[in-house]
Amino acid sequence: EPHSLRYNLMVLSQDGSVQSGFLAEGHLDGQPFLRYDRQKRRAKPQGQWAEDVLGAKTWDTETEDLTENGQDLRRTLTHIKDQKGGLHSLQEIRVCEIHEDSSTRGSRHFYYDGELFLSQNLETQESTVPQSSRAQTLAMNVTNFWKEDAMKTKTHYRAMQADCLQKLQRYLKSGVAIRRTVPPMVNVTCSEVSEGNITVTCRASSFYPRNITLTWRQDGVSLSHNTQQWGDVLPDGNGTYQTWVATRIRQGEEQRFTCYMEHSGNHGTHPVPSGKALVLQSQRTDHHHHHHGLNDIFEAQKIEWHE
């Protein structure tokens, strides 16, 4: 996987009036490392690992850059014509990557009310607009505004990409994203019985890197895909990842099932706990995809955050 730096910014408008401030978070190699504190108007480290390794200067620079980007995004939102009453959002995702062969990529993507309407390649300055008429209108609206804005020149895009790559290289050198291996903790639980079946869930947590194989086996043979339910591999906020896989089995056949895990050349099989006590003690788990971070405002305003 390439090394990547990603910034996620969002501005909101209520009944045609653009709200002050913005929301932002940053990801390094897919791990959250930065969050923007709206109250204090400062970029702050997210996770102990970012706090330990990146110095105060980093957060000063990130605060300045994000403030500028946030202002740009707010100005862009004011120029979106079709704003009806209610709450609206404009989101920008900016990514730069360094690949193994040292080649680089850079792009940014814009979403209005959670819908993608414009993608730009920061290296070629090529734009891609989805087919929908709404996306076409929004993209035209925004690009017309940028044409009037002297800042949005080709030079500006190149500088944007160069700045992002510079930061990425600096962060990588500082060792935030050192390619260490952290083996997963694996935990198997059972939910309550229904019609003679139990749901067994295998959770892997606190592992790095993110690539993992987690699958249920019956008698040592992998169950077919359609009999298993997988969770996304998500950052857990500590520089490591978590995921799960679940399946339904007949009560009394627990000993035939194992959860097989493979991660960074290591592997293991984990049996289903047997016995009534273990089946009943574990609470039922509803598996939802949780979006991490920024939940204070998103929970209140139910804005969809694209990751």
Partner: antibody, heavy 118, light 108 residues
Framework: QVQLKQSGPELVKPGASVKVSCKAS????????IYWVKQSHGKSLEWIGY????????VQNQKFKGKATLTVDKSSSTAYMHLNSLTSEDSAVYYC???????????WGQGTLVTVSS | DIVLTQSPTTMAASPGEKITITCSAS???????LHWYQQKPGFSPKLLIY???NLASGVPARFSGSGSGTSYSLTIGTMEAEDVATYYC?????????FGSGTKLEIK
């Protein structure tokens, strides 16, 4: 490539016991189960049981409980089946097999002939 | 225990002939749990078809499998001399795993 090499033929007296070995190579031993199957002369196949080499967990055919004990030695990538209180009924070829994770008995050992005779 | 009944018990076929061997289960099993093995005289069994219809690695395309529920079959499109062997079906649906009694295929 995956190989399962079993120990040589055994001639044992009734009431005695025997330990059949199955040495695995060509893959990570603790990744896949080892299964044991019996084939009496000119007869069909009977599943005895299996062992998970990673954690030593076993599942057995009720018919062979008390007759066969399955163990592994991870350090030598070897699985063992210990057969006790042997009678003429136990005279058979015993096979070990392993899986590729998609079908049960994907790879087989060459078999070990156990003859119980006084 | 699930009993698997194979038929015929023995059969002789000419080269080029189409062969079908059936396997009937005493209770319904999912197609994911039915496998076929070939055992040539003096050798260990060899996986032929897994999960009812998937050819194991290195198995010629003239072999095929089908079925569901309690009724399964193995077909050899065109019999060849090297196919002389005993064929076994096997279920992995419930413990204990069981094998069919075998079908001995000979050449005319």
């Amino acid at each position: 490539q995956v190989q399962l090499k079993q120990s040589g033929p055994e001639l044992v007296k009734p009431g005695a016991s025997v330990k059949v070995s199955c040495k695995a190579s060509g893959y990570a031993f603790t990744k896949y189960n080892i299964y044991w199957v019996k084939q009496s002369h000119g007869k069909s196949l009977e599943w005895i049981g299996y062992i998970d080499p990673y954690n030593g967990g076993t599942v057995q055919n009720q018919k062979f409980k008390g007759k066969a004990t399955l163990t592994v030695d991870k350090s030598s990538s070897t699985a063992y089946m210990h057969l006790n209180s042997l009678t003429s009924e136990d005279s058979a070829v015993y096979y070990c097999a392993t899986t590729d994770g998609y079908s049960l008995f994907t790879y087989w050992g060459q078999g070990t002939l156990v003859t119980v005779s006084s | 225990d699930i009993v698997l009944t194979q038929s015929p018990t023995t059969m002789a076929a000419s080269p080029g002939e189409k062969i079908t061997i059936t396997c009937s289960a005493s209770s319904s099993i999912s197609s994911n749990y039915l496998h076929w093995y070939q055992q040539k005289p003096g050798f260990s069994p060899k996986l032929l078809i897994y999960r009812t219809s998937n050819l194991a690695s290195g198995v010629p395309a003239r072999f095929s499998g089908s079925g569901s529920g309690t009724s399964y079959s193995l077909t050899i499109g065109t019999m060849e001399a090297e196919d002389v062997a005993t064929y076994y079906c096997q279920q992995g649906s419930s413990i204990p795993f069981t094998f069919g009694s075998g079908t001995k295929l000979e050449i005319k």
